[in-house]
Interface confidence: medium
């Protein structure tokens, strides 16, 4: 786990404490009352102290070079950037018609969503975007997958596997030009068959942070640097999907 302060995480943003965000990023600084990783409802949770997760790779152990968010996105106009490999058909999805207003300030239509589901990410992803996915794992589940797609590439594949050689593991990877890269594996497994879950993905300048059920889980360094072209989130697997939404913090 890292120890970024909120100021570090959002330096230059002109907003030292955005709405819905913990008072500090990660572990609270000294003198903050000793409340590690405080988080508020709807916010990305604070990170647990270093070493809190057994089996977590040490900092720097992940392949995939970190990269800064490109300063000026490529020219464009309207929200609603593209997708990926076509693995997530839009036919039959409530989102496909454009008939539904957002349920809140952001996100997908009310009511259960058909899986696989595509969430358009207007204008790509950008630092301080927070994506929240709510659902319930099906009984006897085998897998869950989130795929942040850039054209036919998968910029970030987040794949909890419930039974890989009788073990539960989360695999993260990137697919470029139809080739999967080196896997990053996480043995901490916060999902349970038949139980509800909340996945939050926070986009940072050089990595994605993932939290599950209000606890920080992992981070994944950007291997696809054109964040503004990561324009669709595909959600699939053995889940009942309640909502998929995003906001800026």
């Amino acid at each position: 786990a890292d120890n970024f302060s909120l100021h570090d995480a959002l330096s230059g943003s002109g907003n030292p404490n955005p709405q819905g965000w913990p008072g500090a990023w990660g572990n609270q600084p000294a003198g903050a009352g000793g409340y590690p990783g405080a988080s508020y409802p709807g916010a990305y949770p604070g990170q647990a102290p270093p070493g809190a997760y057994p089996g977590q790779a040490p900092p720097g152990a992940y392949p995939g070079a970190p990269g800064a968010y490109p300063g000026a996105p490529a020219p464009g106009v309207y929200p609603g950037p593209p997708s990926g490999p076509g693995a997530y058909p839009s036919s039959g999805q409530p989102s496909a018609t454009g008939a539904y207003p957002a349920t809140g300030p952001y996100g997908a239509p009310a009511g259960p969503l058909i899986v696989p589901y595509n969430l358009p990410l207007p204008g790509g992803v950008v630092p301080r975007m927070l994506i929240t996915i709510l659902g319930t794992v099906k009984p006897n589940a085998n897998r869950i997958a989130l795929d942040f797609q850039r054209g036919n590439d998968v910029a970030f594949h987040f794949n909890p596997r419930f039974n890989e050689n009788n073990r539960r593991v989360i695999v993260c990877n990137t697919k470029l030009d139809n080739n999967w890269g080196r896997e990053e594996r996480q043995s901490v497994f916060p999902f349970e068959s038949g139980k509800p879950f909340k996945i939050q993905v926070l986009v940072e300048p050089d990595h994605f942070k993932v939290a599950v059920n209000d606890a920080h889980l992992l981070q994944y360094n950007h291997r696809v640097k054109k964040l503004n072209e990561i324009s669709k989130l595909g959600i699939s697997g053995d889940i009942d999907l309640t909502s998929a939404s995003y906001t800026m913090i």
Partner: antibody, heavy 116, light 109 residues
């Protein structure tokens, strides 16, 4: 330099169909959604829909779902919009515009006139 | 479907600051509506100015800025110039579709 070059003006009969084109250059065509927008004389803008050139996924404004069909040809980096069952209400200028977090590029517009 | 409302017309003078607003019928405009601002000049010449609430497009003068003011999106022209006379459209994103405002005609006298 990003450019969206649209096809020329069209004069068509009521009941007919027309296919408008929008050729993209200067950026990764499959990297951004491509939007179509309608502007009637003296009126505002209406969003028709958008298409993802990488896999042809579409999202339509409900108002246009039976009127417009969006397609792409990736080999030529060209987006198309077919309008069917034309009436005088469809007479307008139609624009293509690509999508990004930072605002930017529009086509020059195609004027469609529906008249007998 | 949501309705997006803008002032129909505003008049300013060269060097003055003018603010255009964009209201949503569904409630407060948030950053997740990715407010866009576009400028229309005669002969159907559209230029994107602002995307994602406050991101100025490349080549757009710094006098144009986007923000959220209260429950609305806003476009501010600081130090208006005569060439800024145009119609300005805002557009808001709602989950899976886009809605335009009616446009604000800005006159620089």
């Amino acid at each position: 330099q990003v450019q969206l070059q649209q096809s020329g003006a069209e004069l068509v009969r009521p009941g007919a169909s027309v296919k408008l084109s929008c050729k993209a250059s200067g950026y990764t065509f499959t990297g951004y959604w491509l939007n179509w927008v309608k502007q009637r004389p003296g009126q505002g803008l209406e969003w028709i829909g958008m298409i993802d050139p990488s896999d042809s996924e579409t999202h339509y404004n409900q108002v246009f779902k039976d009127k417009a069909t969006m397609t792409v040809d990736r080999s030529s980096s060209t987006a198309y919009m077919q309008l069917s069952g034309l009436t005088s209400e469809d007479s307008a200028v139609y624009y293509c515009a690509n999508s990004n977090y930072a605002s930017g590029s529009w086509g020059q517009g195609t004027t469609l006139t529906v008249s007998s | 479907q949501a309705v997006v409302t803008q002032e129909s017309a505003l008049t300013t003078s060269p060097g003055e600051t003018v603010t255009l607003t964009c209201r949503s019928s569904t409630g407060a405009v948030t950053t997740s509506n990715y407010a866009n601002w576009d400028q229309e000049k005669p002969d159907h010449l559209f230029t994107g100015l602002i995307g994602g609430t406050n991101n100025r497009a490349p080549g757009v003068p710094a006098r144009f800025s986007g923000s959220l003011i209260g429950d609305k999106a806003a476009l501010t022209i600081t130090g208006a110039q005569t060439e800024d006379e145009a119609i300005y459209f805002c557009a808001l994103w709602y989950s899976n579709h886009l809605v335009f405002g009616g446009g604000t005609k800005v006159t620089v006298l």
